[in-house]
Amino acid sequence: MAVTACQGLGFVVSLIGIAGIIAATCMDQWSTQDLYNNPVTAVFNYQGLWRSCVRESSGFTECRGYFTLLGLPAMLQAVRALMIVGIVLGAIGLLVSIFALKCIRIGSMEDSAKANMTLTSGIMFIVSGLCAIAGVSVFANMLVTNFWMSTANMYTGMGGMVQTVQTRYTFGAALFVGWVAGGLTLIGGVMMCIACRGLAPEETNYKAVSYHASGHSVAYKPGGFKASTGFGSNTKNKKIYDGGARTEDEVQSYPSKHDYV
């Protein structure tokens, strides 16, 4: 029962984590304009892995994709790669773990096979989580480095752009989503690995021994214990996520033409 619960919980935690990694990768708020000690601008800049956006005080938001590949900083490319690898590994891990779940019966699949699949998916989740954490951390380090540099915009020269206004960028919401999501995927992977140990049939290092007592003989054969409890908790996971960047004057989000006050 405990093994099944651990496996199921590991799967759910990993699922949430991978959904978070995907969300973080797609989010535009990896870095947001630093408003502390800055002149209050009527425009708010924020940047993601794939595009940079500007939200005007008027509410008009304009996003531009990074249409160049060679012009991008190597670090940004590395972060993209880490996040994509994390998503791919996580997705494969989820696929494998679905078939490995003890509560799901697929033909006459042996417990040993399910144990191996559980371990495989667990390792994949751990690596996926580490990739996401590494990617987010590399980006955060890049931001910190750029924050103190005189050329405040970390994408100076990208796509032929020339930096003239000193705009400093700080951590965006996506970084925190990424760290948490990576951590959850990692925890889920560890839980899957722990569950794998309990799923594997116990192999004994000794053979059956016959004891001959006076009068009658009884043979004791140590056998493996097999849990037959099913995992029946219907866990519905709904991820509510708001990736809106907030400025110093904003108090709430609202579905109007502009969300900047």
């Epitope: 002149p39 800049n45 005080s57 509410g59 531009r64 206004v165 705009t167 904003e250 109007s256």
Partner: antibody
Amino acid sequence: EVQLQQSGPELVKPGASVKMSCKASGYTFTGFLMHWVKQKPGQGLEWIGYINPYNDGTKYSERFKGKATLTSDKSSSTAYMELSSLTSDDSAVYYCARLDYGNAMDYWGQGTSVTVSS
Amino acid sequence: DIVMTQSPSSLTVTAGEKVTMRCKSTQSLLNSGNQRNYLTWYQQKPGQSPKLLIYWASTRESGVPERFTGSGSGTDFTLTISSVQAEDLAVYYCQNAYYYPLTFGPGTKLERK
């Protein structure tokens, strides 16, 4: 058609207060910031501040903090500006203007003339 | 606060003439995020409300005649009227639309010769 209709001229005594209105029509009132601008006779334009009609968030120029109070009424699509402790320096035409692309004020009211005189 | 200066303060023109007026800001109005200059030009005729002519330094507002052209970047901007018409006689204001408080230039008055 977008229109900003402002209230009529005001003649007030020094030290008094005045509240002027700006009724919006032809667009979603809560979807745009409403800015207010002052223009003294024969002089240039001076930004007072803005109100976000959606959540009543405001931002004021330092010069007008404590002088101007911006409010809005969603039900009537009207923005208001109240000026307190009036002096002769407050005699001017006050405009309301809608903010759009490029942080540009694309539609302006006809202006409310305020004359402070004893 | 950003200070906007305009030159000349007044211009005497004749119909059909090409007119250029300048606007200077104490800080760059170029936003790095979208490479747009947040400078706006308004026209105010006597006894009327200001009218939007150009935003983003060079984007003409719909309905504004093509003879009005905005240019410049950073701190230096220009409004050009290729062929002045009688109805263009007005005061032209430039405005910083990048930093709060939003600030206007003192204006350039276009007068008939």
